[in-house]
């Protein structure tokens, strides 16, 4: 079915809000543990599917709304399930700037959508 | 505590439109999204879409995308949900709602606002 | 979309017993699974949020399990009070799904 997104975000926004939660912080989410993941393996699914878990945390909800609305493109955003490093967990913050530095990467060189 | 209070019942003609609105209070109107949901009588809860408030960004359900609005007056913390081409189809209670706790699961609702269409 | 599949449609029980109820979706949901209870007349109160977290005030007789597709709500010790409709919503994926509805009510 075409997609619910309208008009869905961009990796633009993205970056920016993802620039917006983590600037000038230490921690997020008073410091909560998230699985590790391959954001490789179609990054925006890769990032909600690990993000998902994390409740009562404001600072980060419209993080997990962008990434959810581009999860949910089909077939752009990639819903190949990721790999979880289950053996591997890391702060919010962590998660979110490797998210911030990927993201970056892919936008600068317009491998994208 | 968080309060959504929704405009009264509307009895509209097909083909017309509605506009329903939301007041909220007891939180930062711009720190989360609301969310619309309606159910038609005696049926289950069908999901519309979501504003956020902060940036006027919306989320729709590709069934409603051509017909309806979603809206939000920060100066009043009023959210409003506007459908048009009205039909008998549209009989419904329409609820807002906010979520707090946990990203996209509604936990506190308006008390909803029964739509009529009728000629 | 995801499908959410909900069943017993209805379910008539015994007060002091347990009730289940299952959800079964389209597709993966991770964690993504809530689920709502809803009296005649009111609007719908969230109970449980992430498959297994109750809200506060939400009692422990409550309990949500499962993972991937498959999901279960359980009331233990069933009630009066604990008639109406159960709705399980996925929030993994936009739209956002509900399951039909499980209709609990008291022999």
């Known amino acids: 079915s075409p997609s619910p997104v309208t008009p869905s975000p961009t990796l633009k926004e993205l970056i920016e809000e993802l620039v917006n939660i983590t600037q000038n912080q230490a921690s997020l989410c008073n410091g909560s543990m998230v699985w590790s993941v391959n954001l490789t393996a179609g990054m925006y699914c890769a990032a909600l599917e690990s993000l998902i878990n994390v409740s009562d945390c404001s600072a980060i909800q419209r993080t997990q709304r962008m990434l959810k609305a581009l999860c949910s493109q089909k077939p752009a955003a990639g819903q190949i399930s990721s790999e979880r490093s289950r053996d591997t967990k890391i702060e919010v913050i962590q998660l979110v700037k490797n998210l911030l530095t990927y993201v970056r990467g892919v936008y600068r060189h317009g491998n994208f959508r | 505590e968080v309060q959504l209070v929704q405009s009264g019942a509307e009895v509209v003609k097909p083909g017309a439109s509605v506009k329903v609105s939301c007041k909220t209070s007891g939180y930062s109107f711009t720190d989360y999204p609301i969310y619309w949901v309606r159910q038609a009588p005696g049926a289950g809860l069908e999901w519309i879409g979501y504003i956020d408030p902060y940036n006027g960004g919306t989320t729709y359900n590709q069934n409603f995308k051509d017909r309806v609005t979603l809206t939000a007056d920060k100066s009043t913390s009023t959210a409003y949900m506007e459908l048009s081409s009205l039909r008998a189809g549209d009989i419904a209670v329409y609820y807002c709602?906010?979520?707090?706790?946990?990203?996209?699961?509604?936990?506190?609702w308006g008390q909803g606002t029964l739509v009529t269409v009728s000629s | 979309d995801i499908v959410m599949t909900q069943t017993p449609l209805s379910l008539s029980v015994s007060p002091g017993e347990t009730a289940s109820i299952s959800c079964k979706a389209s597709q993966n949901l991770r964690n993504a699974l809530a689920w709502f209870r809803q009296k005649p007349g009111q609007s719908p109160q969230a109970l449980i949020y992430?498959?297994?977290n109750r809200y506060p005030g939400v009692p422990d007789r409550f309990s949500g399990s499962g993972s991937g597709t498959d999901f279960t709500l359980r009331i233990s010790r069933v009630e009066a009070e604990d008639t109406g409709v159960y709705y399980c919503l996925q929030h993994w994926q936009y739209p956002l799904t509900f399951g039909a509805g499980t209709k609990v009510e008291l022999k």
């Open positions: 709602a906010t979520a707090v706790v946990a990203t996209d699961v509604m936990e506190n």
């Open positions: 992430l498959v297994s």
